[in-house]
């Protein structure tokens, strides 16, 4: 199968949520863990993760299509100790399959702003702490 | 129809270096990983370690110093090495899909 | 390293029964346990993934439960073809270590 994984973000007032997003079959996402690292250029695992999430097969789903499922990281205040590197990752041990995302990077300013970086989905996002807004 | 297969010498002297050949067919290398396990004669089961979908690998810390796993993709071939055997390596090998499919094994006795 | 013990190392039951192997780790490894199925001269075969999930093709008279650090395998209605040596695998970390296994004999 074509399995594959990527990395978005979405800001809500002043919550900034990290999204990794796997796209699927349904018969193929049983055994899988998404994950998120941070500051974890070589070992990212589910151990060393900031969140994961274990994929389950809905049953509820109908047709062979491809579906996503998501996990989500929220980050309720950014603030200088969340600037680093992240990654999303799946791994499935059952079927020795993983997947590796982009790194992306927060970086918090001076300002009391902070940007993300390296997003492929979205490409350059950059938020505004103070305004709230995405600019 | 996923299929496994193992391949090596046999016999190896003490001190020498193990190499076995798993070539599989029904997928791709680069779709699925491999792991190799090991079975003492009459014992339990041992994790050795896994080359992914995309190449990387990870080893059991306690065989790291002397094992390596590596493929050639086009020819749909794994291969393990591990140096320095001793008697009580001898055991049958495995390699395995994941850890859905198996291998029927390859036979090692280190012997001299 | 999470060590697996596995219980009872060996045990008999009469066609029809229902039997149950127990795997106990040594610390919580969050359900990610497999069940094999050993037969003399033959590989493992995969029975059950994540605690509980049935592999395609394998009956469903064989079912696991379990959370944390207890795990269990029950075998249904036990048919002949099922005397083997069954194995827990936990893959919840490196490295991935199994039980010492259970010999099942059908009298």
């Known amino acids: 199968g074509c399995i594959n994984i990527t990395s978005s973000a979405s800001q809500e007032g002043t919550r900034l949520n990290l999204i990794c997003t796997v796209w699927h079959k349904k018969e193929e996402a049983e055994g899988f863990v998404v994950f998120l690292c941070k500051d974890r250029s070589g070992d990212c695992s589910p151990e060393t993760s900031l969140k994961q999430l274990r994929l389950k097969r809905d049953p509820g789903i109908d047709g062979v299509g491809e579906i996503s499922s998501q996990l989500m990281f929220t980050i309720s205040q950014v603030t200088p100790l969340h600037s680093g590197t992240y990654q999303c990752c799946a791994r499935s041990q059952k079927s020795g399959i993983r997947l590796q995302g982009h790194f992306f990077s927060i970086l918090f300013t001076e300002t009391g702003n902070y940007t993300v970086t390296g997003l492929k989905q979205r490409q350059h996002l950059e938020f505004s702490h103070n305004e709230g807004t995405l600019s | 129809q996923v299929n496994l297969q193992e391949s090596g010498p046999g016999l190896v002297q003490p001190s020498e270096t193990l190499s076995l050949t798993c070539t599989v067919s029904g997928f791709s290398l680069t779709n699925y990983g491999i792991n190799w396990f090991r079975q003492p004669p009459g014992k339990g089961l041992e994790w050795m370690g896994t080359i992914w979908n995309d190449g990387g690998t990870d080893y059991n810390s306690a065989l790291k110093s002397r094992l390596t796993i590596s493929r050639d993709t086009s020819k749909s071939q794994v291969f393990l090495k591990m140096n320095s055997l001793q008697t009580e390596d001898t055991a049958i090998y495995f390699c395995?899909?994941?850890?859905?499919?198996w291998g029927q094994g390859a036979s090692v006795t280190v012997s001299s | 390293d999470i060590r697996m013990t596995q219980s009872p190392a060996s045990l008999s039951a009469s066609l029809g029964e229902t039997v149950s192997i127990e795997c106990l780790a040594s610390e919580d490894i969050y359900k990610n346990l497999a069940w094999y199925q050993q037969k003399p001269g033959k590989s493992p075969q995969l029975l059950i993934y994540?605690?509980?999930s049935l592999q395609d093709g394998v009956p469903s008279r064989f079912s696991g439960s379990g959370s944390g650090t207890q795990y269990s395998l029950k075998i249904n209605s036990l048919e002949s073809e099922d005397a083997a040596t069954y194995f827990c695998l936990q893959d919840s970390e490196y490295p991935l270590t199994f039980g010492s296994g259970t010999k099942l004999e059908i009298k």
């Open positions: 395995a899909r994941g850890m859905e499919a």
């Open positions: 994540y605690a509980s």
